[in-house]
């Protein structure tokens, strides 16, 4: 049998937040129902999970011997403190688009972890901003976004924004 | 190492131009708002201008709105002051500094650069 | 805009005594969000400013306990408990509230008695 350590080196996890209770489960990324120390998983989920906080989680199976996978949970922030504005400028809409996360709270997270993507079309920028100009007016342009922390998504978002008519005579 | 290095500073005569740069490094320049303060010769603090993360809004106090503008190039990790129609009072230590957005904090400033305005 | 003013502008203190400092707005720095944008930095002799609180009462990381700060609407304080000689300098409070019109204290500098 292989080590529980070796077996699980390469895990990934998502994570998943409740606005409710403002609290994250971690969904351990694996096929069989594995057990998670003194973290109790169901469906090989942690639950009750506090945004910036770390939490380690022991993992082993029956499948794997000790030692077992030390898995530590880098914990996002909340995802209620960001929101997906349209910065857009009224003068300027019918050939422009300007998409903005804003940090409407603060967090003890390592801001520095934070990765902001914005996919509009098949244009790709890694910015928390972005400006698109020279548009076709009245055309419908479709953004995604998502935000990720340590290179786990923890939110994301789309906007569809259809840009103005043209000024008569343009 | 989180660093902000501002340069650029000089003695310039009234109604002369002068452009400013802050060379950030060690972070993710375009994901952080950024902002220029003063200091003057009273040992005051003024906010000068601020720059969302892309570049897309600018804010200024009156006291030098229309005279100065900030910008920031993020494939080159710089914030930009340009100062024209400078006068005596804008005679000051000048410090960029980082704001994640507007409600948050300045927490890395840079160690400042002189600007005198005289005659 | 919003004026802050400071007081005292100079704070004699012995080494070990408690020191406080106040700050006042010239109206309310409550956003319309429910929180209050008021922060508190430090600048050392030679130095440029250092945050120590942000949100009022939150103390940055790295910020020893002994500093903590309090108020609400348009009066707040900064306590240091114990003072200590690494805490000399000038201290400015500051309003993010009324975005973009971002406005500082005049300063208050600790100094030994």
């Known amino acids: 049998k292989p080590t529980c350590d070796e077996k699980y080196a390469n895990i990934t996890v998502d994570y998943l937040y409740n606005k409710e209770t403002k609290l994250f489960t971690a969904k351990l990324n694996v096929n069989e129902g594995v057990e998670c120390g003194n973290n109790t998983c169901t469906n090989n989920e942690v639950h009750n999970l506090t945004e910036c906080k770390n939490a380690s989680v022991s993992i082993s199976h029956n499948s794997c011997t000790a030692p077992d996978k030390t898995l530590i949970l880098d914990v996002p922030p909340g995802v209620e403190k960001f929101q997906l504005h349209d910065c857009t400028q009224v003068e300027k809409a019918d050939t422009t688009i300007c998409l903005k996360w804003k940090n409407i709270e603060t967090f003890t997270c390592d801001t520095q972890n934070i990765t902001y993507r914005f996919q509009c079309g098949n244009m790709i920028f890694d910015n928390k901003e972005i400006k698109l100009e020279n548009l076709e007016p009245e055309h419908e342009y479709k953004c995604d976004s998502e935000i990720l922390y340590n290179n786990h998504k923890f939110t994301n978002a789309s906007k569809i924004i259809k840009t103005d008519f043209g000024s008569p005579g343009e | 190492e989180v660093q902000l290095v501002e340069s650029g500073g000089d003695l310039v005569k009234p109604g002369g131009s002068l452009k400013l740069s802050c060379a950030a490094s060690?972070?993710?320049?375009?994901?952080?708002?950024m902002s220029w303060v003063r200091q003057t010769p009273e040992k005051r603090l003024e906010w000068v201008a601020y720059?969302?993360?892309?570049?897309?809004?600018?804010y200024y106090p009156d006291t030098v709105k229309g005279r100065f503008t900030i910008s920031r190039d993020n494939a080159k990790n710089t914030l930009y002051l340009q100062m024209s129609s400078l006068k005596s009072e804008d005679t000051a230590m000048y410090y960029c500094?980082?704001?994640?957005?507007?409600?948050?904090?300045?927490?890395?400033w840079g160690a400042g650069t002189t600007v005198t305005v005289s005659s | 805009d919003v004026l802050m003013t400071q007081t005292p502008l100079s704070l004699p203190v012995s080494l070990g005594d408690q020191a406080s400092i106040s700050c006042r707005s010239s109206?309310?720095?409550?956003?319309?969000?429910?929180?209050?944008?008021l922060e508190w930095y430090l600048q050392k002799p030679g130095q440029s400013p250092k945050l120590l609180i942000y949100?009022?009462?939150n103390r940055f990381s790295g910020v020893p306990d002994r500093f903590s700060g309090s108020g609400s609407g348009t009066d707040f304080t900064l306590k240091i408990s114990r003072v200590e000689a690494e805490d000399l300098g000038v201290y400015y409070c500051?309003?993010?509230?009324?975005?973009?019109?971002?406005?500082f204290g005049g300063g208050t500098k600790l100094e030994i008695k």
């Open positions: 500094a980082r704001r994640y957005d507007v409600w948050w904090y300045f927490d890395v």
């Open positions: 060690g972070f993710a320049f375009s994901n952080y708002d």
């Open positions: 720059i969302s993360s892309g570049g897309v809004s600018t």
């Open positions: 109206q309310s720095i409550v956003h319309s969000n429910g929180n209050t944008y």
């Open positions: 949100k009022v009462s």
């Open positions: 500051f309003q993010g509230s009324h975005v973009p019109m971002y406005t």
